[in-house]
């Protein structure tokens, strides 16, 4: 594949990455799959600057990101190390709350109305953000 040099239509470029902001809601797994089918991933927040950029675009709306602990440890979908990486949890979070009555705890992270993060039930239909890096090779074959 060829290296992607500009963002697809309807994606927003920022700091050598492309972002797509949904306007509908999906469960976390469906949102994750949507991004993968776009040769992207749910957004991985690596800095305060990127946090502010995403926050500006999503507004005060619950929005999934690419962070979960469904298999035990907290993990970013692109392999970015959670332990040493940027974090922006709301106070008291994550809390893996069981009181929602939906079964199980809370395994997926989302931006809250003030931009800080919360863990919630992965089945909730929140908006989501896809991200892909401009420097990575595209899956599309090069034009002949």
């Amino acid at each position: 594949g060829s290296e992607r040099t500009c963002c697809p239509v309807n994606w927003v470029e920022h700091e050598r990455s492309c972002y797509w902001f949904s306007r509908s809601g999906k469960a976390w797994a469906d949102a994750d799959n949507y991004c993968r089918l776009e040769d992207a991933h749910l957004v991985v927040v690596t800095s305060w600057e990127e946090q502010k950029f995403v926050q500006h675009h999503i507004g005060p709306v619950n929005t999934w990101m690419g962070l979960h602990d469904q298999n035990g440890p907290w993990k970013w979908v692109d392999g970015t190390d959670y332990e040493t990486g940027f974090k922006n949890w709301r106070p008291e979070q994550p809390d893996d709350w069981y009181g929602h009555g939906l079964g199980g705890g809370e395994d997926c992270a989302h931006f809250t109305d003030d931009g800080r993060w919360n863990d919630d039930v992965c089945q909730r239909p929140y908006r989501w953000v896809c991200e892909t890096e401009l420097d990575k090779a595209s899956q599309e074959p090069p034009l002949l």
Epitope: N71, G72, P73, K87, E92, D95, G103
Partner: antibody
């Protein structure tokens, strides 16, 4: 690498008290619910208590409610279990475990006997 | 509370053969089920989370399946290090509860 090290076990008389500690390292302690799970000699696993990352939510098994108190100090990466009014049936190896069991300590033996 | 029942209590298997362990919940736990392995004198080790997802570093010969109330742990081609006690645990509702365990022993 996740490391959990329990301490504080020992022999205590019925009605006595013990405080177990669990020192955690290798992960962001405050991001995880922590648990105490026990195992009586030759028996199965028995969940005892859980505490969320910021101590907002605390849960106890009915068998220890009112006698045991779970707490944590995120600044010290430590989990605690204060055990009062101990009974013979509390005799077990007590394990400290991260979230849903993705990390376990080696356990500390608590023996309640006169 | 949700009662977890494992069967059989003991399973005798020859090395290289496969083993199938069952776990039944007294009410639905969706996919909120984990499997643990425990060897004598050691702490339990997480094998499977979410009924079917292998934990980090767990060999592919361990596989989990099922949802609702019926679950299975399959160990294909048993190795010597796989002979141990296996526990299922539901984390669908509080309190989290364990099955009584299945001991996999050498035939």
């Amino acid at each position: 690498e996740v490391q959990l090290v329990e301490s504080g076990g020992g022999l205590v008389k019925p009605g006595g008290s013990l405080r177990l500690s669990c020192a955690a390292s290798g992960f962001t302690f405050s991001s995880y619910t922590m648990n105490w799970v026990r195992q009586a000699p030759g028996k199965g696993l028995d969940w005892v208590s859980s505490i969320s990352g910021s101590s907002s939510y605390i849960y106890y098994a009915d068998s220890v409610k009112g006698r045991f108190t779970i707490s944590r100090d995120n600044a010290k990466n430590s989990l605690y279990l204060q055990m009062n009014s101990l009974r013979a049936e509390d005799t077990a190896v007590y394990y400290c475990a991260r979230d849903r069991g993705s990390g376990w300590g080696q356990g500390t033996l608590v023996t309640v006997s006169s | 509370e949700i009662v977890m029942t494992q069967s059989p209590a003991t399973l005798s298997v020859s090395p290289g053969e496969s083993a199938t362990l069952s776990c039944r919940a007294s009410q639905t736990v969706s996919s909120n089920l984990a499997w643990f392995q425990q060897k004598p004198g050691q702490a339990p080790r997480l094998l499977i989370n979410g009924a079917s997802t292998r934990a980090t570093g767990i060999p592919a010969r361990f596989s989990g399946s099922g949802s609702g109330t019926e679950f299975t742990l399959t160990i294909s081609s048993l190795q010597s290090e796989d002979f141990a006690v296996y526990f299922c645990q539901q984390y669908h509702d509080w309190p989290p509860t364990f099955g009584q365990g299945t001991k996999v022993e050498i035939k």
